[in-house]
């Protein structure tokens, strides 16, 4: 807590500029008007303040806005955002995507901090759903963002937002999350033709039911083994040998290398040996 002291003569700040870096903490407290700071927040980032000095500036803003900062200030926080606690951020009402981007930019290259997580949560809740532009922004900064959400949170993602999802955004999703995302993806991409559809839906297939896998086998997709290995075991088990053969196309030979791993192992055990023999791969049920 900085002690209340009078500002020395001639030191009263008329604007936020580089001269302030030479102010001691108590001088910043006494000589910088909080309202001036709020209107000139965009200048703060251009000035190499020390962490201690930033603490003082934050304190001044906290006093001016005890109920939470207005968005006009939040948008220009810059590195001062790193000083905010999740409790501070919970008081904010962030509605502009530009504000969100500006703050994420400050944290770029780092793990998602509790502050960032709180900010995103506030922003998404304020919007009511995870729209495409928001998802685009969040996954650009944090590719694992989508998979950090619970199935319940993912249920608020509208199908139109799925267009923003890249394959790498789903790398860490578990089956329960893909179960929620897959039907949205199917809806989002339903008007695409066969080959284009498969390219888009491929990374979501870990949530696909048996019927959809059977249907995919009718589209000459030639699914690779890496994708096949990520399918739900319960969805793969009812597939016939002919359907797997059609689904994988030339990649069917890769089943041999995966015969001891799920879901291939469990699928093999479910097939008649006569049927497996027709693949000519030496698979033993």
């Amino acid at each position: 807590e900085v002690e209340k002291t009078a500002c020395p003569s001639g030191k009263k700040a008329r604007e936020i500029d580089e001269s302030l870096i030479f102010y001691k903490k108590w001088e910043l407290e006494a000589c910088v008007d909080a309202a001036l700071l709020a209107t000139q927040m965009d200048r703060v980032n251009a000035i190499p303040f020390t962490y201690e000095q930033l603490d003082v500036l934050k304190h001044k803003l906290d006093e001016l806005y005890p109920q939470g900062y207005p968005e006009s200030v939040i948008q220009h926080l810059g590195y001062l955002f790193l000083k905010m606690s999740p409790e501070d951020i919970r008081k904010w009402n962030v509605t502009s995507l530009e504000t969100l981007k500006a703050l994420l930019e400050v944290n770029k290259g780092h793990e998602m901090s509790p502050q960032v997580a709180t900010l995103i949560d506030r922003f998404v809740k304020g919007r009511g759903q995870l729209d495409k532009d928001t998802l685009d922004t969040l996954t650009a900064f944090y590719p694992g963002y989508l998979c950090s959400l619970s199935p319940e949170e993912l249920s608020s993602v509208p199908p139109s937002s799925i267009w923003a999802v890249r394959p790498q955004d789903l790398d860490t999703c578990d089956p329960r999350q893909l179960d929620v995302l897959y039907p949205k993806a199917r809806l989002a991409f339903q008007n695409m033709n066969g080959s284009e559809y498969f390219v888009k839906i491929q990374s979501f297939l870990g949530g696909a039911p048996t019927e959809d896998l059977k249907a995919l086998s009718q589209q000459n997709v030639s699914m690779d083994l890496a994708t096949f290995m990520k399918l739900r075991t319960d969805a793969v088990l009812p597939l016939t040998v002919a359907e797997v053969q059609k689904l994988l196309g030339p990649h069917v030979e890769g089943l041999k290398a995966e015969e001891r791993h799920r879901p291939v192992r469990d699928w093999i055990l479910r097939q008649r040996q006569d049927d497996l023999d027709t693949l000519g791969l030496g698979l033993q049920g």
Epitope: K214, A215, S217, Q218, N220, V241, A242, Q245, K246
Partner: antibody, heavy 117, light 107 residues
Framework: EVQLVESGGGLVQPGGSLRLSCAAS????????MSWVRQAPGKGLEWVAT????????YYPDSVKGRFTISRDNSKNTLYLQMNSLRAEDTAVYYC??????????WGQGTLVTVSS | DIQMTQSPSSLSASVGDRVTITCRAS??????LNWYQQKPGKAPKLLIY???RLHSGVPSRFSGSGSGTDFTLTISSLQPEDFATYYC?????????FGQGTKVEIK
């Protein structure tokens, strides 16, 4: 043993409608796609429609698209073909067949549909 | 659509003869080629699928070969019950199409 038994064929006027049924037994009906294939008198085989195991997906050739509708009731182990706006060239024996990936592996005995005035 | 052309349209042969029927696809269908046998007044029956795999219960005198666009059905030693019409069918691409049929008659 897989058994497929078609019914519902008969004589119908051009422009008329008919619904064919196919009762399946001897296997788990809901595990397989099903199809209809027809054969005009003295002619070859023509695929008419396919439906996915749960009924979500349907496939048709251009010759019947918009006129024929394939459906199924898995609780009754029954496949259907609703044929509307029938034409003389739709006259054929209609077979229901189990469809496995790319193979029509089991066929019914067929039911004759005659479209004539 | 993929056109399937069988030849010959019909042939006459004797019991014990080796019979060969060919089927040509208008474009590459990989090995998704099936053969069916149909006797007069009866439903077709699957004989061979995926070019060369025998369906259950089909005698080993039937065999298939080929890939891409050209395929062959061979009956190594024709039996009285083999006199029928044979159809090829491609299962590579929708719409699935059949050849026009080859009728095998008694000489």
């Amino acid at each position: 043993e897989v058994q497929l038994v078609e019914s519902g064929g008969g004589l119908v006027q051009p422009g008329g409608s008919l619904r064919l049924s196919c009762a399946a037994s001897g296997y788990t009906f809901s595990d397989y796609f099903m199809s209809w294939v027809r054969q005009a008198p003295g002619k070859g085989l023509e695929w008419v429609a396919t439906i996915s195991n749960g009924g979500t997906y349907t496939y048709y050739p251009d010759s019947v698209k918009g006129r024929f509708t394939i459906s199924r009731d898995n609780s009754k182990n029954t496949l259907y073909l609703q044929m509307n706006s029938l034409r003389a060239e739709d006259t054929a024996v209609y077979y229901c067949a189990r469809f496995d990936g790319y193979i029509f592996d089991y066929w019914g005995q067929g039911t004759l549909v005659t479209v004539s005035s | 659509d993929i056109q399937m052309t069988q030849s010959p349209s019909s042939l006459s042969a004797s019991v014990g003869d080796r019979v060969t029927i060919t089927c040509r696809a208008s474009q590459d269908i990989s090995n998704y080629l099936n053969w069916y046998q149909q006797k007069p007044g009866k439903a077709p029956k699957l004989l061979i699928y995926y070019t060369s795999r025998l369906h259950s219960g089909v005698p080993s005198r039937f065999s298939g070969s080929g890939s891409g666009t050209d395929f062959t059905l061979t009956i190594s030693s024709l039996q009285p019950e083999d006199f029928a019409t044979y159809y090829c069918q491609q299962g590579n691409t929708l719409p699935y199409t059949f050849g026009q049929g080859t009728k095998v008659e008694i000489k």
